[in-house]
Amino acid sequence: ASHSGMINPSRQWQTLKQNTGVAHFEYQIRVTCDDYYYGFGCNKFCRPRDDFFGHYACDQNGNKTCMEGWMGPECNRAICRQGCSPKHGSCKLPGDCRCQYGWQGLYCD
């Protein structure tokens, strides 16, 4: 027996029925992506990390979910202290605010 058609990756088992006239086949099938691959074509990669390159987990669709305090597509840009001057302050650690030379204060303003 053979089946042709699209079977989308899923954790659920699908029941396929086939009647050849000679015999009746009923079988269950599922397609799962390799670890860290998501999407209909299993071509979306997401592996959680907590290092120089990013700070994130992955949701069930393979989207990066940033740890609190981090932002950007790779979750590797720290979210500075609320009120930190975007012009004269920056941070490498969430909640921090480091001033450019010549600027000072809690918010570098």
């Epitope: 290092d51 987990a57 949701d59 740890m67």
Partner: antibody
Amino acid sequence: EVQLVESGGGLVQPGGSLRLSCAASGFTFSNYGIHWVRQAPGKGLEWVGWITGNGGYSDYADSVKGRFTISADTSKNTAYLQMNSLRAEDTAVYYCARAGSWFAYWGQGTLVTVSS
Amino acid sequence: DIQMTQSPSSLSASVGDRVTITCRASQDVSTAVAWYQQKPGKAPKLLIYSASFLYSGVPSRFSGSGSGTDFTLTISSLQPEDFATYYCQQSYTTPPTFGQGTKVEIK
């Protein structure tokens, strides 16, 4: 105030099992993650493994892979380190540390002694 | 895995001395290096992150420098409370790895 409290350490025989807990407070557990780091008596620091805040992913040092399992109960804001097939070389103080900002926040540690 | 090699493994110094500890990574880790201080029976404390950034609440006598493979922790004027063990750590990739530690003792 961020707080991490480990518990569950003790004396166990080689080949035995032990489960450590890391109770977190002062932050939203599911938005971060937890690392486990250990320190053998008189020795340096060794990373053991970590788990994401949603509990969906964990990774381990080669030295414990297949023997240790990290899990999380987000409803209890607690991470667990299940240690099986323990060896004498697993004797150490075990610390948990919050993910997401270097290791800025640590627990006080819990001592695990593997001896017959 | 990335190896972090610290030197010296121990040193003796007096209060007021300038102390320098070095750490070498087995491969380029950019600036993804932190320094920790640990006292007996206590958890490590973060001193420096991203190679040169002083962590909140840490005295300004502590400073860090370096990038790539060579990093330095400097204590400009050693205080009695600074006698402890210091560790470097890379957070460039998983697994994070630590140096073997440098014990700073009283001369």
